[in-house]
Amino acid sequence: EVEKTACPSGKKAREIDESLIFYKKWELEACVDAALLATQMDRVNAIPFTYEQLDVLKHKLDELYPQGYPESVIQHLGYLFLKMSPEDIRKWNVTSLETLKALLEVNKGHEMSPQVATLIDRFVKGRGQLDKDTLDTLTAFYPGYLCSLSPEELSSVPPSSIWAVRPQDLDTCDPRQLDVLYPKARLAFQNMNGSEYFVKIQSFLGGAPTEDLKALSQQNVSMDLATFMKLRTDAVLPLTVAEVQKLLGPHVEGLKAEERHRPVRDWILRQRQDDLDTLGLGLQGGIPNGYLVLDLSMQEALS
């Protein structure tokens, strides 16, 4: 903390301007009025204060606003935002998307910091749900944002917001997250025609159930292998060879290269070898001819 000393004669700041970069920390503390700083925060970002000098300016604002900064100040924090702790940010009430954008801009190009995560959390909680404009903004700055949320948090995403999601935003999502997002996407895109629908829903299919995959297989969608490999194993297993062939279209040949990997490996084990042979791909490991397959799960359900 900077020692309190009297401001030297003639150095009292009348406005926040470039001359202040020549002040030592103790001079900033002594010569810059906190209320002046608060009203001219929009100038701070344009002035190349060192990080040490920014510490002093933050200290002045902390003293002026012990209960947390008003949004008029927060919106213009600029580089000073990098000096805030999650504890500082928890005191804020950020309601404007413009404020959120301004602060995310400062952190642009860096990993999501604890400060940014706290800011987003405060903002989303204040709004009550992750609306489309917010999601648009967050995924523009952090493509992996959606996949950083828990399934519980994702449940507050309204289907209308799904339109803002790009395929790369889902790259790091796990099946539990896609299980939540897929029904929302299905609802959001329900009025689109076949091929357009498939283009939009494709990234979300890691959460699709068997019946939806069966339905897609009737629509000549030509799913690529990368998408197929991300499908839920339990959703793929009940598909017949004919259904998988229709689902993949010309991409069916790619199954050979993936025959040792899930879900292809597990699916092969469930198919009759005769049926697999009809694909002409040399897939091995199916149920030999003449064997009877008992589905014990069905038997248990009936008893």
Partner: nanobody, 115 residues
Framework: EVQLVESGGGSVQAGETLRLSCTAS????????MGWYRQAPGDECELVST???????NYADSVKGRFTISQDNAKNTVYLQMTSLKPEDTAIYSC?????????WGQGNLVTVSS
């Protein structure tokens, strides 16, 4: 990667002259505002002088009229000409891009002025 190589420090008598040089690489030099910072033993970091991309210069009150900052864009080099040196100018001098905001942190050049 931004690199700044400083030279020209040393020991002089009060009233003498010294010129510091700083050669930059890894960024667009002629678009950048540059500055010289200094830190005396046991004192705070202080900005001594700045030169903006358009060539305009500014100085701390303590060095006005004695120090001159200049740059040679062809050589990617910024200079600090220090005349009428005083013992209180003794410090480690560092050249920085103003956008880096790091002030005196890191390496620098020792200038010692004895009376």
């Amino acid at each position: 990667e931004v690199q700044l190589v400083e030279s020209g420090g040393g020991s002089v008598q009060a009233g003498e002259t010294l010129r510091l040089s700083c050669t930059a690489s890894g960024f667009t030099f002629d678009d950048s505002d540059m500055g010289w910072y200094r830190q005396a033993p046991g004192d705070e970091c202080e900005l001594v002088s700045t030169i903006s991309s358009d060539g305009s210069t500014n100085y701390a009150d303590s060095v006005k009229g004695r120090f001159t900052i200049s740059q040679d864009n062809a050589k990617n080099t910024v200079y600090l000409q220090m005349t009428s040196l005083k013992p209180e100018d003794t410090a480690i001098y560092s050249c920085r891009t103003m956008a880096s905001r790091i002030g005196c942190w890191g390496q620098g050049n020792l200038v010692t002025v004895s009376s």
